[in-house]
């Protein structure tokens, strides 16, 4: 696994930069984890046809994702940023139990999925302390979300492969939307 | 565990109707979908039709699109298709399949669970 932001060498041989900004930091994180999603989908997309074919194979999802929509403020047009810091908090607290599931389903990336799951857990920190209003911040409810992964768990070998496909895709495109807006704020 | 059993095949002339049924025994159905698969002789297993049985939405391959219905009876556990307008390309056996979970709903074969033991359905012209 790559080592943490803030832990490269580079850092260790320059001692006398100056020290990241609270944005800077966050960025740095996002872009770390998007490079684990990208190690994560690679073995994902080497393993079987699914990225190509999901488009085809499916007719229904169901598994409720987060994502970015207009109403939450994030996008150029319309761009409210307390209400977008709500929305990229709560949905990566919501994938936190997606991300639950990703353990134990990679071989070769076993620790990446575990970095990618700690990284989020250190970046919603982050930007708790960058929120003012944290009480409209609602976190998804233990018991549903052991409920839900008991159900991702029970499904046979091909639709647990097309889940977690569908669960780094979704995951990469709501961090690179959450960092295109946080570069706004 | 879940058992599904089809019935209602059998031979019909072009244009005719058949209605399929697929009843399942040891299954609530209360989350996975139903669908209906058919293979040809020489020819892989495709998808038919399915149904969710969260929302009841319903889809279908376009090749039936129009002439088949999908349908579903909660009380019967219970999946019915209703195939009008047959044509002689229709002749297939005609399998039913189960999913247990329901978050995703798909038209591939490896995305069920549970099959039945499938119905013949022959079209003459």
């Known amino acids: 696994a790559p080592v943490p932001p803030g832990e490269d060498s580079k850092d260790v041989a320059a001692p006398h930069r100056q020290p990241l900004t609270s944005s800077e930091r966050i960025d740095k994180q996002i872009r770390y984890i998007l490079d684990g999603i990208s190690a994560l989908r690679k073995e994902t997309c080497n393993k079987s046809n699914m990225c190509e074919s999901s488009k085809e194979a499916l007719a229904e999802n169901n598994l409720n994702l987060p994502k970015m929509a207009e109403k939450d403020g994030c996008f150029q047009s319309g761009f409210n940023e307390e209400t977008c810091l709500v929305k990229i908090i709560t949905g990566l607290l919501e994938f936190e139990v997606y991300l639950e599931y990703l353990q134990n389903r990679f071989e070769s990336s076993e620790e990446q999925a575990r970095a990618v799951q700690m990284s989020t857990k250190v970046l919603i920190q982050f930007l708790q302390k960058k929120a003012k209003n944290l009480d409209a911040i609602t976190t998804p409810d233990p018991t549903t979300n052991a409920s839900l992964l008991t159900k991702l768990q029970a499904q046979n070998q091909w639709l647990q492969d097309m889940t977690t496909h569908l669960i780094l895709r979704s995951f990469k495109e709501f961090l690179q939307s959450s960092l295109r807006a946080l570069r706004q704020m | 565990q879940v058992q599904l059993v089809e019935s209602g095949g059998g031979l019909v002339q072009a244009g005719g109707s058949l209605r399929l049924s697929c009843a399942a025994s040891?299954?609530?159905?209360?989350?996975?979908?139903m669908a209906w698969f058919r293979q040809a002789p020489g020819k892989e297993r495709e998808f038919v039709s399915a149904i969710s049985w969260r929302t009841g939405t319903t889809y279908y391959a376009d090749s039936v699109k129009g002439r088949f219905t999908i349908s579903r009876d909660n009380a019967k556990n219970t999946v019915y298709l209703q195939m009008n307008s047959l044509k002689p390309e229709d002749t297939a056996v005609y399998y039913c399949?189960?999913?247990?979970?329901?978050?995703?709903?798909?038209?591939?074969?490896?995305?069920?669970?549970?099959w039945g033991q499938g119905t013949q359905v022959t079209v003459s012209s």
């Open positions: 399949a189960a999913e247990r979970v329901g978050l995703l709903l798909a038209v591939v074969a490896e995305g069920y669970d549970y």
């Open positions: 040891g299954r609530t159905f209360s989350n996975g979908p």
